[in-house]
Amino acid sequence: EEELQMIQPEKLLLVTVGKTATLHCTVTSLLPVGPVLWFRGVGPGRELIYNQKEGHFPRVTTVSDLTKRNNMDFSIRISSITPADVGTYYCVKFRKGSPENVEFKSGPGTEMALGAKPS
């Protein structure tokens, strides 16, 4: 059985205010069963950026259809970027549990920073 890896290929992503940013995340295995969530930051205070199952994320859309059974792409797009969006974003795999899901593995993170405005 292949051990799951969380792949976030970009270490740094330069974005432009007002544009849409794409944060890439793919997994190498469908197991263990459980959701992938997106966070900004680390530690107890990390901010939830996207949870497919529940929540309100008006500026976030998924690149792929997460409801497809064999989906391994958990990339997201964040629209209308502002300076307040900078930070390091992590996709995190949870293992389905009862009553709570358990954090299983995190991607290495992608730092989103503001790039120069296009001339």
Epitope: G41, P44, R46, E47, L48, E100, E103
Partner: antibody
Framework: DVQLVESGGGLVRPGESLRLSCAAS????????VTWVRQAPGEGLEWVSL???????YYADSVKGRFTISRDNSKSTLYLQMNGLRAEDTAVYYC???????????WGLGTLVTVSS | EIVLTQSPGTLSVSPGERATFSCRAS??????LAWYQQKPGQAPRLLIY???TRATGIPARFSGSGSGTEFTLTISSLQSEDFAVYYC??????????FGGGTKVEIK
């Protein structure tokens, strides 16, 4: 505007219980960790407890085993169940929103808990 | 647990003057240090995080500096509304989140 409003404080005797509430508005409650910080009369700030966005709970050693933090995302409300209260728990209890930087960017006005016989 | 020590305990300053006070950590916190302001009867307010980044809406007269174990908060020209107690907090090693004991800035 972000608003945090604590309630539930009051005067209790040592050994008794109290449940504090903090009603949040002006931000997407489910997306942020929230915390309790207390301040004894004339003293400095002391962190008490935090609950993360996924429901993981953290406590200061001084309250571990006596206090329980919880959140009701459907009501955008944070709670602190305080059992076995002691005189040294007397303080103003503030709830605060936690940023992804692990700092506390918005605070309520606080609710006073007095433990005295 | 990281212990934060603030000095001085009280600082007497005249309006318009510069105020500088410090926060020392018992072990390195990198740049992960925040400052809060608290006025009597009010909740604390976040001023600075990451040692030198001003929080939203904080005037430019407040500036933070330092890294590792030694940090400074400077108010370039004290206004009447700046007389308050100032607390530092480390945000690198949790739990617990720890605060300094505070520096009271009073009118000279």
């Amino acid at each position: 505007d972000v608003q945090l409003v604590e309630s539930g404080g009051g005067l209790v005797r040592p050994g008794e219980s109290l449940r504090l509430s903090c009603a949040a508005s002006g931000f997407t409650f489910t997306n942020y960790a929230v915390t309790w910080v207390r301040q004894a009369p004339g003293e400095g700030l002391e962190w008490v407890s935090l609950i993360s966005v996924t429901g993981t709970t953290y406590y200061a050693d001084s309250v571990k085993g006596r206090f329980t933090i919880s959140r009701d995302n459907s009501k955008s409300t944070l709670y602190l169940q305080m059992n076995g209260l002691r005189a040294e728990d007397t303080a103003v209890y503030y709830c605060a929103k936690v940023t992804w930087k692990n700092v506390f960017d918005y605070w309520g006005l606080g609710t006073l808990v007095t433990v005295s016989s | 647990e990281i212990v934060l020590t603030q000095s001085p305990g009280t600082l007497s300053v005249s309006p318009g003057e510069r105020a500088t006070f410090s926060c020392r950590a018992s072990q390195t916190v990198g740049s992960k240090l925040a400052w809060y302001q608290q006025k009597p009867g009010q909740a604390p307010r976040l001023l600075i995080y990451d040692a030198n980044t001003r929080a939203t809406g904080i005037p430019a007269r407040f500036s933070g500096s330092g890294s590792g174990t030694e940090f400074t908060l400077t108010i370039s020209s004290l206004q009447s509304e700046d007389f308050a107690v100032y607390y530092c907090q480390q945000h690198t090693d949790w739990p617990p989140y720890t605060f300094g004991g505070g520096t009271k800035v009073e009118i000279k």
